[in-house]
């Protein structure tokens, strides 16, 4: 009988230890949840305040209407230029209108003067058609003025107030474009 009682007592003690462990785990879990909630709230607040304070374009980018432009300070070939833009969440400049072309050339005059800048225009090797990087065709007034004599792939660039063409493997500055952040205010 005594043996039975001591066995029951041991079982009860074991149960108590398990419950204490469960309670400890629960307390730890609750604390962890609270910390996570705090972290989440802080993260959300930071995100919201930075979104509220942020300008439509990053630092060193120029805004015009719904676009942000970055004029590079380094030279690279056309393909590397494209990758450099992608790293910044942008693509090579795609000129949609004469107004945009005028804005770009006007800005370039102020910034750097008469240099060559790659844009997102290339000539299909088979058809000879000029296409923007997203596959769309340039408007008739925005076709490169001269056909490059290169046997290699040909890409478009801006110089002064003209669109020209050159071997894609030549080194030039480049212009990236991304969408401006919409203001929620």
């Amino acid at each position: 009988k005594l043996l039975q009682v001591s066995t029951i007592a041991m079982q009860q003690q074991e149960k108590l230890i398990q419950q204490e462990r469960a309670l400890l785990n629960f307390t730890e879990w609750k604390r962890s949840c609270a910390l996570q909630m705090k972290y989440c709230q802080a993260f959300m607040q930071n995100s919201l305040s930075s979104a509220h304070n942020s300008s439509p374009c990053p630092n060193n980018w120029i805004q015009n209407r719904e676009s942000c432009y970055y004029v590079s300070e380094i030279w690279s070939i056309w393909h590397t230029s494209q990758e450099n833009c992608l790293k910044e969440g942008s693509t090579l400049l795609q000129i949609e209108s004469k107004e945009e072309m005028d804005f770009i050339t006007g800005s370039l005059r102020k910034i750097k003067g008469s240099y060559d800048y790659w844009v997102g225009l290339s000539q299909d090797g088979h058809s000879g058609r000029w296409l923007w990087q997203d596959g769309s065709s340039p408007s008739p007034g925005l076709l490169p003025a001269e056909r490059s004599q290169s046997a290699n792939q040909v890409c478009g660039y801006v110089k002064s107030n003209s669109l020209l063409s050159s071997n894609c493997s030549t080194w030039k500055y480049f212009i990236c474009e991304k969408y401006a952040l919409r203001s929620s205010v």
């Epitope: 990758e83 992608l86 969440g89 942008s90 997203d134 596959g135």
Partner: nanobody, 115 residues
Framework: QVQLQESGGGLVQAGGSLRLSCAAS????????MGWYRPALGEQRELVAA???????TYVDSVKGRFSISRDNAKNTVYLQMNSLKPEDTAVYFC?????????WGQGTQVTVSS
């Protein structure tokens, strides 16, 4: 770190279609763009198509009008819809994530187009 997992490759007849998927995990908030690459003659890999987080796209001339890149932000996945496939599209297609500081590559998925 960003981990990328490609899928969707396979064997298809010329003129057929395939859709490749690239799922990103890890530090996805640092990704500014994602793209698909394939080996090219004389170069290591050529950029086939890419899409930025803002939705801007770029394609290599040889696939314009046939391939389309898109993304599903909720699934952290980028897709490459490949239509009117040609034997010359046969390659291992690699997914790449662009961040400001470094680039991350997937293991690749084989696409074979038979004539």
């Amino acid at each position: 770190q960003v981990q990328l997992q490609e899928s969707g490759g396979g064997l298809v007849q010329a003129g057929g279609s395939l859709r490749l998927s690239c799922a990103a995990s890890g530090s996805i908030f640092s990704i500014n763009a994602m793209g698909w690459y394939r080996p090219a003659l004389g170069e290591q890999r050529e950029l086939v198509a890419a899409i930025t987080t803002g939705g801007r796209t770029t394609y290599v001339d040889s696939v314009k009008g046939r391939f389309s890149i898109s993304r599903d932000n909720a699934k952290n996945t980028v897709y490459l819809q490949m239509n009117s496939l040609k034997p010359e599209d046969t390659a291992v297609y690699f997914c790449k994530a662009f961040t400001r500081d470094e680039d991350f590559w997937g293991q690749g998925t084989q696409v074979t187009v038979s004539s």
